[in-house]
């Protein structure tokens, strides 16, 4: 697994640098999981043929993903620092079902899929602590997620592989576009 | 392999509006990740940046001259255009659209078209 | 807006000389800043990404550093071929900024 954000050989050669701030350590933390859900890609597309498939023909899934829309505030054409910043919150916790979904689905990359998973629930915590309004962050339904998590290992092993694409694809267009938010507040 | 390539009107009127189209080959503008923007350089002036479009629809324009110009994308026509209204004089420069690609945007032109001149 | 300022504006240069441009963001900007050259009557070219990362059939005499908000472009033995303008680009956010250039000229 990578070095977790702040423990990169970089940072030991450099013992004066000045401390990460929380924008800039929210920015490291994206860019390490980034980096895990790239690794876990790999895998999957050398298992199996899907990464080839078009957008379109992946389109026609039944799992609601979090993606970002311009209603959520973090595009440049109404952008609301807040509004984006609950939303983005909400979207992380949404794909934490599907997180762990990926738990057991990869033969070498296991350590990785658990690392993306961890680093995930520090992520949200460093932007809790940025929030201001914690109350207009809704949490999922555990037993919605458990009945969700039955269903999605209860698939047969094309739609499972099927689904593990779409789910790295779609959290990595959601953490691309929150990293690039996060930067304009 | 990647390449752009700006087209458009050489000469405009004062007051008239300005239509750039750069067509792309060698990548989609629907992968996560990718953009692409427009730069201007005056002669013998430096760079300056225009605006921006990404994969998902997400439009960035230069703050001085946002009232003037829309940027959108054609996605299955491996277009963008650049529409800038009210021309001026002072708008005389190199137009150039680039590409950006990579997981952390890093916002980087790792390619430039050859530019087309506007005067 | 974060504005680049690059230094010198203009570096009178001997090949094989070993030289150093300066680019200073009005802000700290991480490790989102990028190099490019411009030879005269040519598209700008990406030079260096995100500081030091080196860029494919990019020689590597052309080396970065930094971090912050202060960075440097270093050519470790000037060829002929050198000579043009180099720009830094702020790449954390927008609007994108460019320094005015520094102009490499031989002597």
């Known amino acids: 697994a990578p070095v977790p954000p702040g423990e990169d050989s970089k940072d030991v050669a450099a013992p004066h640098r000045q401390p990460l701030t929380s924008s800039e350590r929210i920015d490291k933390q994206i860019r390490y999981i980034l980096d895990g859900i790239s690794a876990l890609r790999k895998e999957t597309c050398n298992k199996s043929n899907m990464c080839e498939s078009s957008k379109e023909a992946l389109a026609e899934n039944n799992l609601n993903l979090p993606k970002m829309a311009e209603k959520d505030g973090c595009f440049q054409s109404g952008f609301n620092e807040e509004t984006c910043l609950v939303k983005i919150i909400t979207g992380l916790l949404e794909f934490e079902v599907y997180l762990e979904y990926l738990q057991n689905r990869f033969e070498s990359s296991e350590e990785q899929a658990r690392a993306v998973q961890m680093s995930t629930k520090v992520l949200i915590q460093f932007l809790q602590k940025k929030a201001k309004n914690l109350d207009a962050i809704t949490t999922p339904d555990p037993t919605t997620n458990a009945s969700l998590l039955t269903k999605l290992q209860a698939q047969n092993q094309w739609l499972q592989d099927m689904t593990t694409h779409l789910i790295l694809r779609s959290f990595k267009e959601f953490l691309q576009s929150s990293l690039r938010a996060l930067r304009q507040m | 392999q990647v390449t752009l390539k700006e087209s458009g009107p050489t000469l405009v009127k004062p007051t008239q509006t300005l239509t750039l189209t750069c067509s792309f080959s060698?990548?989609?503008?629907?992968?996560?990740?990718?953009?692409v923007g427009w730069v201007r350089q005056p002669p013998g002036k430096a760079l300056e940046w225009l605006a921006f479009?990404?994969?998902?629809?997400?439009?960035y324009y230069s703050p001085s001259l946002e009232s003037r110009l829309t940027i959108t994308k054609d996605t299955s026509k491996n277009q963008v255009v650049l529409t800038m209204t009210n021309m001026d004089p002072v708008d005389t420069a190199t137009y150039y659209c680039a590409r950006s690609y990579d997981d952390y945007l890093y916002y980087a032109l790792d390619y430039w078209g050859q530019g087309t001149l506007v005067t | 807006d974060i504005v680049m300022t690059q230094s010198p504006a203009t570096l009178s240069v001997t090949p094989g000389d070993r030289v150093s441009l300066s680019c200073r963001a009005s802000q700290s900007i991480s490790d989102y800043l990028h190099w490019y050259q411009q030879k005269s009557h040519e598209s700008p070219r990406l030079l260096i990404k995100?500081?030091?990362q080196s860029i494919s059939g990019i020689p590597s005499r052309f080396s970065g550093s930094g971090s912050g908000s202060d960075f440097t472009l270093s050519i470790n033995s000037v060829e002929p071929e050198d000579v043009g303008v180099y720009y830094c680009q702020n790449g954390h956010s927008f609007p994108l900024t460019f320094g005015a250039g520094t102009k490499l000229e031989l002597k």
């Open positions: 479009i990404f994969w998902d629809d997400d439009k």
């Open positions: 995100s500081v030091s």
């Open positions: 060698g990548f989609s503008l629907s992968t996560s990740g990718v953009g």
